[in-house]
Amino acid sequence: KLLQVSTIAMQQQEKLIQQERALLNFTEWKRSCALQMKYCQAFMQNSLSSAHNSSPCPNNWIQNRESCYYVSEIWSIWHTSQENCLKEGSTLLQIESKEEMDFITGSLRKIKGSYDYWVGLSQDGHSGRWLWQDGSSPSPGLLPAERSQSANQVCGYVKSNSLLSSNCSTWKYFICEKYALRSSV
């Protein structure tokens, strides 16, 4: 009789362990579902906002052909400007042609007037060559007009309709550039 009771007790305990395990699995599954739901909702939200905001450039950015430009409202040194653009999914302005230079200088005249704006151009410390931040060389017509007398690192900036050079540690406005979103229509 005692053996029978003990067997029943063991069976009940086994059942209880199985139920606890099932409950744990269910809780885990529920948590996983909730997490997936959250990601799904976030994805939907992003998709909807992208569909709703189908403008090729973000707010406060200017479009020209395949590019979007942002003219900063704060001053910073060249390296910080580079980081500020990167945070926004862009890089400091890289001027590829005279047409682009004309658009930029024309836009700046309208927006702010004759201030200094860092672009993604800097001088290589060893060779003294001018290079864009991605390592490419500027076309001959797009080299800074004056060589800075600074012993420190030298970076390029736009002022009025000229490309000039200055110590990278001076404070200036800056211009970021990113690709415009292609219309999916």
Epitope: L86, K87, G89, S90, T91, Q133, G135, E177, K178
Partner: nanobody
Framework: QVQLQESGGGLVQAGGSLRLSCAAS????????MAWYRQAPGKQRELVAG???????TYANSVRGRFTVSRDNAKSTVYLQMNTLQPEDTAVYYC??????????WGQGTQVTVSS
């Protein structure tokens, strides 16, 4: 929340090469950009290289021509190929990610030591 895991650091002789990897817990093409920073003892953290969601690239002047940043969207991983390493490149290298709201996320860092 974006989790980042760096790997590939180590000890290397001057003139040698290393390749750092940064694996992200999210699809990296949904991010604004990803970047590599470094911090040498007693110095400020500085940007080394960055790559935007659309593939634009930027390098610090000190590493341009020696380091190359790249990414593999399928693996959600960003790489930093470091060639011609110099003792001045010795630092802890951090991977950073900026989401669509420009919020920064940081990895734990990986030590790179270049001996002369």
């Amino acid at each position: 929340q974006v989790q980042l895991q760096e790997s590939g650091g180590g000890l290397v002789q001057a003139g040698g090469s290393l390749r750092l990897s940064c694996a992200a817990s999210v699809n990296i093409d949904t991010l604004n950009s990803m970047a590599w920073y470094r911090q040498a003892p007693g110095k400020q953290r500085e940007l080394v290289a960055g790559i935007t969601g659309s593939g634009q690239i930027t390098y610090a002047n000190s590493v341009r021509g020696r380091f190359t940043v790249s990414r593999d969207n399928a693996k959600s991983t960003v790489y930093l190929q470091m060639n011609t390493l110099q003792p001045e490149d010795t630092a802890v290298y951090y991977c950073a990610a900026y989401d669509r709201s420009s919020t920064p996320y940081w990895g734990q860092g990986t030590q790179v030591t270049v001996s002369s």
